[in-house]
Structure formats: C-alpha cells, structure tokens
C-alpha cells in the first residue's frame, strides 16, 4: 500500500555546479497526475529544494526561479539541479506523490548524496 522510489546513492556535481539523477517509482496504480519534490537533508535539517506537479506524458514544470529542471518518461523522472556550491553538498531525497486519481500514494527514496566541489580559481597568467 506504499510506493517504492529508487534513486542513485551518490552523484558528483559537475565543475559548473550541475548534478543530475534519476528518480524512479513503482506506481501501484494508473496515476495521471504526479508530484515530485526534492528535499535536502543536512545536519538533521530538511529543506525543500524544488517541487513540480506534472500530468503523465507531459513535461515537468518547475517554478521560473527554481534551481531544478526535469523530464519525465513513464515512471522515471530525470532531475537536474543547477547552481550548486560546495556548501550544498548533502543528501537529496526524492519524494513522489500520486495525486490523481484517488487513492493517493506516497513514496520517498533513500536519498542521493550529492558531492559538490567548488572549482579552483584560475591562476593569473603572466605573459
């Protein structure tokens, strides 16, 4: 009566501060509307990174000022988080909710540890 959600254990952000991972859920029903939320857990503090509700077969739409983008394919959501800095290193948890039609189902992944390493500043060049 609950939904299983799978996501990778570890992801390393690119030097440009971009991290991507797949959040996959085993839908117990034929949902037409799904909500995906990314939560960040660090030092027992939880913050909502971003959230999007989408109709099956349509694209995810995050708010304009969101640091997340994503695409969906069946029961898979490909999430990309941008603008990450070293201080954003933490556990990023995928929460999936089947919103419509009833019944509602909730699924929470075990989290993806995203490591972010700030790039070294370019040394001054002497010519």
């Amino acid at each position: 009566k609950a939904m299983h959600v799978a996501q990778p254990a570890v992801v390393l952000a690119s030097s440009r501060g971009i991290a991507s991972f797949v959040c996959e859920y085993a839908s117990p029903g034929k949902a037409t509307e799904v909500r995906v939320t990314v939560l960040r857990q660090a030092d027992s503090q939880v913050t909502e990174v971003c959230a999007a509700t989408y109709m099956m077969g349509n694209e995810l739409t995050f708010l304009d000022d969101s640091i997340c983008t994503g695409t969906s394919s069946g029961n898979q959501v490909n999430l990309t988080i941008q603008g990450l800095r070293a201080m954003d290193t933490g556990l990023y948890i995928c929460k999936v909710e089947l919103m419509y039609p009833p019944p509602y189902y909730l699924g929470i992944g075990n989290g993806t540890q995203i490591y972010v390493i700030d790039p070294e500043p370019c040394p001054d060049s002497d010519f």
């Epitope: 009566k1 609950a2 939880v46 909710e97 919103m99 019944p103 909730l106």
Partner: antibody, heavy 119, light 108 residues
C-alpha cells in the same frame, strides 16, 4: 510560529449544512497538504479529508464523500470545510491539521471545533 | 483500506515504569509511513513519532518507535506523570489515512 485556529462549529439539525474555517498563520498553506480530522465524543480519531498544495486535488474519506467539500482562500491563508446533508454520526470535534514534510502525518493541529448534529 | 489495531486497549502502569504499546496493520505498511500521537483529555493530539522511529520536534527521548511490515511499537522508557494519556498510531503511505483505535495509558 505555526498556528491553526478553527471556527464555525455549532448545533445543526440533520440534513442541514455548516461551514468550518481554519485560519493558518506562520506558514503558507499552498506548501502543505492540509487535512481535517474528526473525533466523535469519547471515540478515536478519524481522517476526513485533505486539500493538496495548489488546491486542485482533494481527497475525502468514504464516510463524507459527496457531502463535504474542501476549499481554500490563499489571500486569507484560510481553509474551509463545507459540510452538507449532515447526519447524527457527523457529530464530532473537527480538527484542522497540517501534513508533514515527509508525508501526511500531522505535525500541527488546531484546538478543534465541536459540531453537534441533532434535532 | 489499511486497518490498524492497537493493543492493549488500556495499560495500567506506575510512574517510572516502561510502557510498550503495539500497533498492528491489516497489511504491510512501509516503516517510513507510520506515526504515533499522544492525546490528553480536552486537547488536540500531539505528534510524537513519524517514519516509525523519528521523534517529532520537542519530543523527549524517552519516547521511541520501532517496527516494520505489520507490527509497530511505541515505547516510553520511563513513564512521567504527564505521559498518562491516550496514544494513537496512524499510517500515511496511501489514502485513506487511517488511525488505530488508541491505547489508554493510565495510572495503576
């Protein structure tokens, strides 16, 4: 700090209607699932209904489906429960409760408002 | 619909004793989606535990939750006078979000 305050309870005859309000402060309603839970006198807790996030999706317990309707006024940060065709078995204290970050457990509750359905 | 059964119905104990409350589900419930509440007469319920074992903000560490599948337990390691109340379990993995009938912990 988070606060939920219910109002609108009272005595009503069977078959009549009543509207309950839940004024929220300290957070934004649209970021959470907002629930109503009721408790008949001397009985346990019964989940009644939820309105989700943007307010488009609502789910109801079978016992109230088709009779109760949830709505929300974002400008007032207030939740409403419209109760129609009331029955004696709807007599209860009605609590407004906020769903948690990790799911629909209820991390904050109002003080409750008593609805008595009696002729 | 998941049906939750709580036992015992009433638990009579003295302050300082250990209380063990049981919640059994009619079908398997992920441990991530089970909560416990405390309710005192005339008051709204108060969240104690969510996710089967995570204590809510401000809840003392004498309260602990455990379990998986269909069997869950709330333990109060040493009962304080303010702990005598009714305790409810609740699942929230899917709707409807049902509660157990409650266990009353009273003073022996």
């Amino acid at each position: 700090q988070v606060q939920l305050v219910e109002s609108g309870g009272g005595v009503v005859q069977p078959g009549r209607s009543l509207r309950l309000s839940c004024a929220a402060s300290g957070f934004t309603l649209s970021n959470y699932g907002m629930h109503w839970v009721r408790q008949a006198p001397g009985k346990g807790l019964e989940w009644v209904a939820v309105i989700w996030y943007d307010g488009r999706n609502k789910h109801y317990a079978d016992s109230v489906e088709g009779r109760f309707t949830l709505s929300r006024d974002n400008s007032k940060n207030t939740l409403y429960l419209q109760m129609n065709s009331l029955r004696a078995e709807d007599t209860a204290v009605y609590y407004c409760a906020r769903g948690g970050v990790w799911g629909s457990y209820f991390d904050y509750w109002g003080q409750g408002t008593l609805v008595t359905v009696s002729s | 619909e998941i049906v939750l059964t709580q036992s015992p119905g009433t638990l009579s104990l003295s302050p300082g004793e250990r209380a063990t409350l049981s919640c059994r589900a009619s079908q398997s419930v992920s441990s991530s989606y089970l909560a416990w509440y405390q309710q005192k007469p005339g008051q709204a319920p108060r969240l104690l535990i969510y996710g089967s074992s995570s204590r809510a903000t401000g809840i003392p560490d004498r309260f602990s939750g455990s379990g998986s599948g269909t069997d869950f337990t709330l333990t109060i390691s040493r009962l304080e006078p303010e702990d005598f109340a009714v305790y409810y379990c609740q699942h929230y993995g899917s709707s409807p979000f049902t509660f157990g009938p409650g266990t009353k912990v009273d003073i022996k």
